[in-house]
Structures are given as C-alpha cells and as structure tokens.
C-alpha cells in the first residue's frame, strides 16, 4: 500500500485507495463521490488556466 | 485463461461462521479489485464485498457489515471471505468476481460460485 | 441508495426477433450502467460495460444505449444461447453498487 506522501500522483490525477493508484480527476465532476475526488479539490486539474496573474 | 474458482460453502448452522476461498488463475492478480457477489436461490444478484488490490481498502454491504470480512493474499493468488454470525437470509450462492481496471465499474470475469447454506 | 428497475420482467420471443430490455435507475448514473447475462446454475457474464461498449468476445448483435436514468440493451436477432436472465449494474454509487431485478428472456 502507498504510504502517504511518497511517489505523488501527477498533476490532474489524485491517488485512489480504492484502487492502489492515481485517478484522473477530469472523471470527478461526473462521478464526485470516487474516493480520489477528495484529493482533486486541493489542486486544479492540469487544464485549469488561472484567469488572475 | 482466466479462472476464479471458490470453495468452502457447505450447510452451517445460524449463528455459526465459514470461510470462502477463491483461487485465481490465469491472470496477474495483484493489480485487481475484487468482489463477492450473491445470490440468493431464485433471486437476483447482491453485492457483498469489495477488496482494493492491495488489501488496503475494503466496503461491505450493509446487510453484512460487522459480520463479514473481506481479505486476500496476493502471494497465494486468492480472496476470502470471513462470515461469522450467519443468517438464515446469507443463504446464497456466493461468487468471486475480478472488477474492472477502472473504478469499480465492471465485473468481467466471474467465479462458477459455491452455496452456502444457513439453516437448522 | 440508488434502485434500478427492468422492464419487463419476462420476455417471451422467438429465434430471430429483435428484443429490448430496458433498466431505469432512480437518479442519474451517467453511463455507469452495465448489462451481464445468466443462465440457469451458471456465473453472470459481462456483455456490455459503460452502458454501450462491448465486451470483449461477446457477439455484436448485443449493444446497449442510453444515459442518466433510461438504458436499454437490444439483442438484434435472438439466438437459441441467448435465451437466459438479464441483469443490469450501476457503478455509479461504487462501492455501493447494485443490480435490476432482472429479466428473463424465454421461448415463446
């Protein structure tokens, strides 16, 4: 099992304990409930453009 | 070929407890969820169990939970499940199911099941 | 809890007709929807996953469709080994996942 905060999922995916491994989270807004859908929250999806400097 | 085979199901008494087996065969087992399904005689299907690759992460139903325990070994190929305290309504055929390599989404192989039957 | 609901429950039909189950789930499930078939004494197998895609092996006169709350899984021209049980899944809810009641596909 991934001991937390060794090998980070990359950016737009969050690790799923459910499934031993990282998710993309662009499968979030259909399916938010996906227990890696927490850890999305904390970061913006890798297609997410800052509308401020 | 992928195979699930399970064992242990047999006539036991309520109240008394019994170990299912599911040796898994043909594929790499490790990297996959896996399930227990029932289904009782005459009646449709019942999710029971589920297993995270790892053993790490596990959920039951609520119709077994705190009597159930979902486990696997991943260096012997196989999933079990614990049932203790067992109900006239756990009568079942019980099937092991290898989920999808995705979210929980799919059972795509399954085993042929084993009965168990809980009565006096 | 998410129900899921199958119409009908018995299908009469006969070799070569074209057949329609239809599965409803109580609220949207997106296209988590999917569809496995039984036969007497035997295991489920999967035929259709994400509500229409096909699984691998499974003939090509299965297809399902549908999204949300409305799915259907058609069997273009019956065969005699498809005479069986049909259950449909939603894994939108994972893990609290359930099956239809199912639909029994017999000889008419």
């Known amino acids: 099992e991934r001991v937390p905060g060794t090998t980070p999922c990359s950016r737009g995916s969050s690790w799923s304990a459910d499934l031993d491994k990282c998710m993309d989270c662009a499968s979030c807004p259909a399916r938010p409930h996906s227990d890696f859908c927490l850890g999305c929250a904390a970061a913006p999806p890798a297609s997410f453009r800052l509308l401020w400097p | 070929e992928v195979q699930l085979l399970e064992s242990g199901g047999g006539l036991v008494q309520p109240g008394g407890s019994l170990r299912l087996s599911c040796a898994a065969s043909?594929?790499?087992?490790?990297?996959?969820?896996m399930m227990w399904v029932r289904q009782a005689p005459g009646k449709g299907l019942e999710w029971v169990s589920y297993?995270?690759?790892?053993?790490?992460?596990?959920h039951y139903a609520d119709s077994v939970k705190g009597r159930f325990t979902i486990s696997r070994d991943n260096s012997k190929n196989t999933l079990y499940l614990q049932m203790n305290s067992l109900r006239a309504e756990d009568t079942a055929v019980y099937y092991c199911?290898?989920?999808?390599?995705?979210?929980?989404?799919?059972?795509?192989?399954w085993g042929q099941g084993t009965l168990v039957t809980v009565s006096s | 809890d998410i129900q899921m609901t199958q119409s009908p429950a018995t299908l009469s039909a006969s070799v070569g007709d074209r057949v329609t189950i239809t599965c409803r789930a109580s609220q949207s499930i997106s296209s988590y929807l999917n569809w496995y078939q039984q036969k007497p004494g035997k295991a489920p197998k999967l035929l259709i996953y994400a509500a229409s895609s096909l699984q691998s092996g499974v003939p090509s006169r299965f297809s399902g469709s549908g999204s949300g709350t409305d799915f259907t899984l058609t069997i273009s021209s019956l065969q005699p080994e498809d005479f069986a049980t049909y259950y449909c899944?939603?894994?939108?809810?994972?893990?609290?996942?359930?099956f239809g009641p199912g639909t029994k596909v017999e000889i008419k």
């Open positions: 899944q939603q894994s939108y809810s994972s893990p609290g996942i359930t």
């Open positions: 297993i995270s690759p790892s053993g790490g992460k596990t």
């Open positions: 043909g594929f790499t087992f490790s990297p996959y969820p």
């Open positions: 199911a290898r989920g999808g390599d995705t979210y929980f989404d799919y059972f795509d192989y």
